[in-house]
């Protein structure tokens, strides 16, 4: 009796179970009573990443330098090419089809995580005791100057955008 369902990595055709093609290969012809499924490898610029009965391999992604992209990992017959962005840029989306410049953290904010080719700069507000007076994609919030260690006193309080201003201690005469 012909099968109605097939095992894993098989498919049903002409009332018989044929093997799927392994990753990196495409289907050329179904199995017959005489021969196994006919599969052929994907050509150099193509891939298939699953057990399949695809008749065409997928083209490797092109990392377009005009969009700020470069190859992070070259594709194989079983994997797609992975693109990333040139320095100073990051991917606009998870699929990384184009790049945008890293954002800078404004004064009052510091860099929590420096941007990579695939993620943007993460900024955080400078907490009390820290400040940032520049717009930067690299600089963290810096601590206020400790006037005491310089044997000075705070003459002007710091903010999240400015450092404290230290000055000499007032010497009271006896």
């Amino acid at each position: 009796e012909p099968p109605t369902a097939c095992r894993e990595k098989q498919y049903l055709i002409n009332s018989q179970c044929c093997s799927l093609c392994q990753p990196g290969q495409k289907l050329v012809s179904d199995c017959t009573e005489f021969t196994e499924t006919e599969c052929l490898p994907c050509s150099e610029s193509e891939f298939l990443d699953t057990w399949n009965r695809e008749t065409r391999c997928h083209q490797h992604k092109y990392c377009d330098p005009n969009l700020g992209l470069r190859v992070q990992q070259k594709g194989t017959s079983e994997t797609d090419t992975i693109c990333t962005c040139e320095e100073g840029l990051h991917c606009m989306s998870e699929s990384c089809e184009s790049c945008v410049p890293h954002r800078s953290c404004l004064p009052g904010f510091g860099v929590k995580q420096i941007a990579t080719g695939v993620s943007d700069t993460i900024c955080e507000p400078c907490p009390v005791g820290f400040f940032s007076n520049v717009s930067s994609a690299f600089e963290k919030c810096r601590p206020w100057t400790s006037c005491e260690t310089k044997d000075l006193v705070v003459q002007q309080a710091g903010t999240n955008k400015t450092d404290v201003v230290c000055g000499p201690q007032d010497r009271q005469r006896a």
Partner: antibody, heavy 117, light 111 residues
Amino acid sequence: EVQLEESGGGLVQPGGSLRLSCAASGFDFSSNTMCWVRQAPGKGLEWVACIYAGSSGSTYYASWAKGRFTISKDISKTTLYLQMNSLRAEDTATYFCARGLSRFSLWGQGTLVTVSS
Amino acid sequence: DIVMTQSPSSLSASVGDRVTITCQASQSISNYLAWYQQKPGQAPKLLIYDASKLASGVPSRFSGSGSGTDFTLTISSLQPEDFATYYCQGGDYYGSSYVVAFGGGTKVVIK
């Protein structure tokens, strides 16, 4: 019964055209690669062209066949075709249709094409 | 394009003999090689595919071996019905297209 049956061969003058057909039956035509192979009288086998019979329709040609010969298929009729133009005496051969690409697991009996004036 | 060189072009042998036919590809074709048997007035019949896999229904006296560029068809003990012409067939990608080629054939005749 699983079979391939060629037709359309015959006598044609040099420079003429001919269209060969291959009717497939007994298997799922649309999920197979189908090819034409020819054999000149008393000579060896020579690959002509192949096509994936499904929707993708990927085609493959021998370098000498490009331009003069065109392979095509009709899924609804489960039929493979070979359009041959500008025929020459050296195209005289038995033309076989076959299933497969890296191996030919099923063959028709062939149709004879004679190019002569 | 790929070229398949088959040798010998003919050989004479007796029933019971061990027969070996070789096929060389002009470039590596991995294991994508098939062997066929053809008798006069008939279509070729697939014997071996993927270099060493026996097509169903083919007697076990036929075997294939090899990979890359060098391949062999062996008939361990020649039978009367084995007198025929044998062809190898290889294929490989040429750019993004696939190209098929046959060897010139080996005619096995009775000694």
